[in-house]
Amino acid sequence: YSTSHPCFVSRPCLNGGTCHMLSRDTYECTCQVGFTGKECQWTDACLSHPCANGSTCTTVANQFSCKCLTGFTGQKCETDVNECDIPGHCQHGGTCLNLPGSYQCQCPQGFTGQYCDSLYVPCAPSPCVNGGTCRQTGDFTFECNCLPGFEGSTCERNIDDCPNHRCQNGGVCVDGVNTYNCRCPPQWTGQFCTEDVDECLLQPNACQNGGTCANRNGGYGCVCVNGWSGDDCSE
């Protein structure tokens, strides 16, 4: 049916679009960049990315249409909705602060929550992270007792242990939680790179031509025989 198919008879895909036969009399056009529509008949108005603030662009009859995210308005979703123009967002005397696409309530002492609708209890829930323990120090104040290795008002920071590191034999410090580890060069191992790697065990054929391998701190050597020489008795 190929010669009588619309793809060949009417050549429906415009502006350089490619026609794909789906069945005896149906087709689908793959449009060139910059064109859209069933038959690639429309210029793709979305190509210039006219829709702002994360909105979704669709093309209809050479025109673009933007579907805005909550908190934005306008033909191109370019205008931030000022939620604070509508009273009553923030309760208990909270101050409304407009933000791009949203708003935030700054609550008076004693209240918390998105709308300042909850009573504030310093340690319920605990603001202390990383295993820190919350202790109420007043009606509206608290302090966090941090586990070793953490600091900050809510124990949010892992203390960098590398400034005081003791990585030996060319080891490079990698910070951990209240400790550090050392990334060792190939000849050394152990948490602090203090353990010598026995290259003679790792490489049984390190020495050629009957040479004997002798492990040393940070390396190895070959004791050559029968006139052989060189680092690995190969010369």
Epitope: D161, H165, R166, C167, Q168, V172, N178, Y180, F192, T194
Partner: antibody
Amino acid sequence: EVQLVESGGGLVQPGGSLKLSCAVSGFTFSDFYMEWVRQASGKGLEWVAAQRNKANDFSIVYSASVKDRFTISRDDSKSTLYLQMNSLKTEDTAVYYCSRDGGRLALDAWGQGTLVTVSS
Amino acid sequence: DIQMTQSPSSVSASVGDRVTITCQTSEDIYSGLAWYQQKPGKSPKLLIYGASRLQDGVPSRFSGSGSGTDYTLTISSLQPEDFATYYCQQGFKYPLTFGGGTKVEIK
């Protein structure tokens, strides 16, 4: 044979300065951490300052009691470690030892020590 | 800073006695502990590193043990030349810290 020999100690007035030297031999100087440790008469050992090795960019650490007053440095061409001591206090009076950190988290070689006396 | 608590501060013993010195650290030092011997007017001498490893040339009557925060130096049979002051030292991180010392005296 590993050897460390300190020099430069002596009597100095409070607020004065002194520079200690530690000449080393018998090992590749730049491969090792080097430390200064002091000992007041009849007291225990107190770590003063350290300079890490070439692999650790010769980075430096000081004890809180000498920070901003003492400066550790080294001259690899002379295989010598230094301790420049400024704004000296009477409590800095001690025998100062230079030591090598032997790659095992321990100080495996020590100099004979040099006495620094801070007194008016 | 890591605190080092060494005990006892002194011990009286006789030749042939077994002597034990302990060192406790304020946090885990991952076996990064060394023991030194110091005689009057002399520099300290390394005996044990890595909590339990004997430094070259040190007699086998000296031994070290421990992990985490608790470490021990043992002299199995005290010899006349062992009368000295002994220090522990953590090498886990700067600032390096030493124990207060243990003086081993003749009974």
